[in-house]
């Protein structure tokens, strides 16, 4: 395994309909043609898989299809959207990409995006 | 805990054919690169041929054109069909899975299993 370098924005926050996007891009030291690219939340030193999905270069990325994430790939750059986001899915969202072919296999890890999701505020009664 | 068991090796005449299977628990096809090693006595282990998630395969030189990769999802299982052997194929074959879980690289390797190519 070789390591490299997976760059991503520090903080980003959500639309009031509870989507993020940001853009994940990963130094690749050969042409890769299989990626594999996983978001992953930490929170409270604990670490859980929010999507992944490989895809061939050139090709869209495909998510499976209950999946909360979306994304596009452009070169070595992997733009990502996660819907469906409440204030309580606030956290560091980080970015794993690994380049599965050709060999050498490489495994490259980002230091995060915070993102900040706040609720909505409900619209007030309104008397007429 | 990814677990891999290794079976079908055994004794074949030198141009015989031999058929490795790998057996995997779980689904792991979908995020690890699946291969399989050799180590023959006195050398050190190499890489014999691997498949990707995307089904891509990656073959040593010395066995393409004669050894096949392929998997089964339905059945998570990886084989390696072997046609033509010879005598320096002789060696402890083992199942190997890496790629990362979580915020780590993962490998994990199989018990092995001998494959002797003699007359």
């Known amino acids: 395994c070789k390591a490299m370098h997976v760059a991503q924005p520090a903080v980003v926050l959500a639309s009031s309909r509870g989507i993020a996007s940001f853009v994940c891009e990963y130094a690749s030291p050969g042409k890769a043609t299989e990626v594999r690219v996983t978001v992953l939340r930490q929170a409270d030193s604990q670490v859980t898989e929010v999507c992944a999905a490989t895809y061939m270069m050139g090709n869209e990325l495909t998510f499976l299809d209950d999946s909360i994430c979306t994304g596009t790939s452009s070169g070595n750059q992997v733009n990502l959207t996660i819907q469906g986001l409440r204030a309580m899915d606030t956290g560091l969202y980080i970015c794993k990409v690994e380049l599965m072919y050709p060999p050498p296999y490489y495994l490259g890890i980002g230091n995060g995006t915070q993102i900040y999701v706040i609720d909505p505020e409900p619209c007030p009664d309104s008397d007429f | 805990e990814v677990q891999l068991v290794e079976s079908g090796g055994g004794l074949v005449q030198p141009g015989g054919s031999l058929r490795l299977s790998c057996a995997a628990s779980?689904?792991?096809?979908?995020?690890?690169?699946m291969g399989w090693y050799r180590q023959a006595p006195g050398k050190q282990r190499e890489s014999v041929a691997t498949i990707t998630p995307g089904g891509n395969t990656d073959y040593a030189d010395s066995v393409k054109g004669r050894f096949t990769i392929s998997r089964d999802g339905a059945k998570n299982t990886v084989d390696l069909q072997m046609n033509s052997l010879k005598p320096e194929d002789t060696a402890v074959y083992y199942c190997n899975a890496r790629g990362s879980s979580g915020l780590s690289m993962s490998t994990y390797w199989g018990q092995g299993t001998q494959v002797t190519v003699s007359s």
């Open positions: 779980g689904n792991i096809f979908s995020r690890y690169i």
